[in-house]
Interface confidence: low
């Protein structure tokens, strides 16, 4: 349906206050280096635009579309130019183009400092000194840092934030209510960036036909008793909300994904038995609750696949009539009966089924030549099993900081290239996996594991893009989304990589080692572990958890003297010989 | 299997000096931190002092600093302790632990124990 004004539609539609926050977070995610004062003023500027075309919605520039409106309002900022360079050559390209070109120049690793938390009392007295704008700069800080966030899930996350201030400010132990909270919706927000990072990823590298057939796969797993129309009707549905997210149509994204709320809650009946708490709540914790949603119980007496795939003469028949409508029903029917497996790994047995009729159907006898298909899968699952079961056994014994460990020395031999701050950053991730989905029972590991490692492996793409340094991560991250995961499970070490020049200067530390957190210091012994392998990618695992041990010795040695900085200095000299002997640098 | 084996315990007075020394076997010694510990009558099991795989690194729990020194001899597979202006605090079940990565004091990182030797500081 066809508005006069489409600013005007979205207003009306998300209210006063939805609007401001997705404008925010809109210009937030596209100009990541802007001041926070600079985003308010243009967002108060749209507002009042929007106003007057609710009150008129013939009102000159009325008609035009949020790309323009939008895109012109970013184009008045002074220091475009400067602060962001070749982005400011965005203005002089008409829509879509000009908004094409803003979202290639989305930064996912930003050059922003890191954010501190300040003391708690100092954090409440802000909130209560002006909450709206305490609230506008959690969605300003997160949104600029993560320009993907999904940005109806981010209101959500404003909210729950809101809530642990307004609960924990009044508290008589405020550090103790307020801090686990934050925590936690830290470690919720980063995982929920992460995600939706793959999404957009999968949209934007891989087209909507590789979106769909995931949400296919992923909705035919949660909604086994839904009908395949069902299932194909929210799929479309879904496709519009995140590809109008992912393009930067966060208006449209946000008032699609409640429409779809609305809609899968009016009939759930006919999706899902799992609905009923979910739909009980408000708008945003609504959609939230619908997109965690647990799997709803297989119907029973479900039929075999291999009947309709396999046996049926009319396979070829049915295939050649609607090749797309007979793979996603087949899709469909494998996940709603295998909740046990990872999504990509219902990708992958879909793809091979697709490349077998396509080979067969142009056969002489194709029942013959297709009658085996089934067979093809049992090495496609085995695969990830094993694996899995295998890292989980590591897991078990090592614990997560040095499984962590042991991933990093595996990740550092196979692109040796990638800077070492991304190989850290995704290694902990990665080893993240173990405490995340090991406990789980094995009908449970593998979505768990696999679908999870697909998230963080998308993180190690989308950095590596941006500045690309190995060949061989561009050709894992590239040739085949579903099959990332496999291709850098058989990366050998690289055996092209030249060592880097042993530098002392990586292997000096000082004494505000000792004042880290826990977590920062892992970070840093990690950093030099990293920094060890490419000095010597050929250094055995015995030879590197002696250099380990001895620098955590060193530290904890040095932590524990009179003169901290002067043991650093001393003792530090002593481990780089060390090292350098014990690996034969 | 892997043993560990205590001796050197045994009564000294205060002032004294004993060597406790902890033979290894069934594992790659080199490949092994090693600490010892000890246990008083009715307290609780506690970190005396660890060095790590090559030997270059030590830990030493204040209580003992400046009077016990710990070495190993990778060649032999044992570990030393030389405890020296023993006091009668120092009164304990010694044992033996190996860690297979550096331990920062939790005993629940040493992997492998000794059955202890006793250590009397009396007058």
């Known amino acids: 349906d066809a508005h006069k004004s489409e600013v005007a539609h979205r207003f009306k539609d998300l209210g006063e206050e939805n609007f401001k926050a997705l404008v925010l977070i809109a210009f937030a995610q596209y100009l990541q280096q802007c001041p926070f004062e600079d985003h308010v003023k243009l967002v108060n500027e749209v507002t009042e635009f929007a106003k007057t075309c609710v009150a008129d919605e013939s009102a000159e520039n009325c008609d035009k579309s949020l790309h323009t409106l939008f895109g012109d309002k970013l184009c008045t900022v002074a220091t475009l130019r400067e602060t962001y360079g070749e982005m400011a050559d965005c203005c002089a390209k008409q829509e879509p183009e000009r908004n094409e070109c803003f979202l290639q120049h989305k930064d996912d690793n930003p050059n922003l400092p890191r954010l501190v938390r300040p003391e708690v009392d100092v954090m409440c007295t802000a909130f209560h000194d002006n909450e709206e704008t305490f609230l506008k700069k959690y969605l300003y800080e997160i949104a600029r840092r993560h320009p993907y966030f999904y940005a109806p899930e981010l209101l959500f996350f404003a909210k729950r934030y809101k809530a642990a201030f307004t609960e924990c400010c009044q508290a008589a132990d405020k550090a103790a209510c307020l801090l686990p909270k934050l925590d936690e919706l830290r470690d919720e927000g980063k995982a929920s960036s992460a995600k939706q990072r793959l999404k957009c990823a999968s949209l934007q590298k891989f087209g909507e036909r590789a979106f769909k057939a995931w949400a296919v796969a992923r909705l035919s797993q949660r909604f086994p008793k839904a009908e395949f129309a069902e299932v194909s009707k929210l799929v479309t549905d879904l496709t519009k909300v995140h590809t109008e997210c992912c393009h930067g149509d966060l208006l449209e994204c946000a008032d699609d994904r409640a429409d779809l709320a609305k809609y899968i809650c009016e009939n759930q009946d006919s999706i899902s038995s799992k609905l009923k708490e979910c739909c009980e709540k408000p708008l945003l914790e609504k959609s939230h609750c619908i997109a965690e949603v647990e799997n709803d119980e297989m119907p029973a007496d479900l039929p075999s696949l291999a009947a309709d795939f396999v046996e049926s003469k009319d396979v070829c028949k049915n295939y050649a009539e609607a090749k797309d409508v007979f793979l996603g029903m087949f899709l469909y029917e494998y996940a709603r009966r295998h909740p046990d497996y990872s999504v990509v790994l219902l990708l992958r047995l879909a793809k091979t089924y697709e490349t077998t009729l396509e080979k067969c159907c142009a056969a002489a006898d194709p029942h013959e030549c297709y009658a085996k298909v089934f067979d093809e899968f049992k090495p496609l699952v085995e695969e990830p099993q094993n694996l899995i079961k295998q890292n989980c056994e590591l897991f078990e014994q090592l614990g997560e900081y040095k499984f962590q460990n042991a991933l990093l020395v595996r990740y550092t031999k196979k692109v040796p290239q990638v800077s070492t701050p991304t190989l850290v950053e995704v290694s902990r991730n990665l080893g993240k996996v173990g405490s995340k989905c090991c406990k789980h029972p094995e009908a449970k590991r593998m979505p768990c594991a696999e679908d999870y490692l697909s998230v963080v492996l998308n993180q190690l793409c989308v950095l590596h893009e941006k500045t690309p340094v190995s060949d061989r991560v561009t050709k894992c991250c590239t040739e085949s989304l579903v099959n990332r995961r496999p291709c850098f499970s058989a990366l050998e070490v690289d055996e092209t990589y030249v060592p880097k020049e042993f530098n002392a200067e990586t292997f000096t530390f000082h004494a505000d080692i000792c004042t880290l957190s826990e977590k920062e210091r892992q970070i840093k012994k990690q950093t030099a572990l990293v920094e060890l392998v490419k000095h010597k990618p050929k250094a055995t695992k015995e030879q590197l958890k002696a250099v380990m041990d001895d620098f955590a010795a060193f530290v904890e040695k040095c932590c524990k003297a009179d003169d901290k900085e002067t043991c650093f200095a001393e003792e530090g000299k002593k481990l780089v010989a060390a090292s350098q002997a014990a690996l034969g640098l | 299997d892997v043993q560990l084996v205590e001796s050197g315990g045994g009564v000294v007075q205060p002032g004294g000096s004993l060597r406790l020394s902890c033979a290894a076997s069934g594992l790659t010694f080199s490949s092994y931190a090693m600490g010892w510990f000890r246990q008083a009558p009715g307290k609780e099991r506690e970190r005396v002092v660890s060095?790590?795989?090559?030997?270059?690194?030590?830990y030493y729990a204040d209580s003992v600093k400046g009077r016990f020194t710990i070495s190993r001899d990778n060649s032999e597979n044992t570990v030393y302790l030389q405890m020296n202006s023993l006091r009668p605090e120092d009164t304990a079940l010694y044992y033996c632990a190996a860690a297979r990565y550096w331990a920062t004091g939790s005993e629940y990182e040493f992997d492998y124990w000794g059955q202890g030797t006793l250590v009397t500081v009396s007058s």
């Open positions: 060095i790590s795989r090559g030997g270059g690194y030590t």
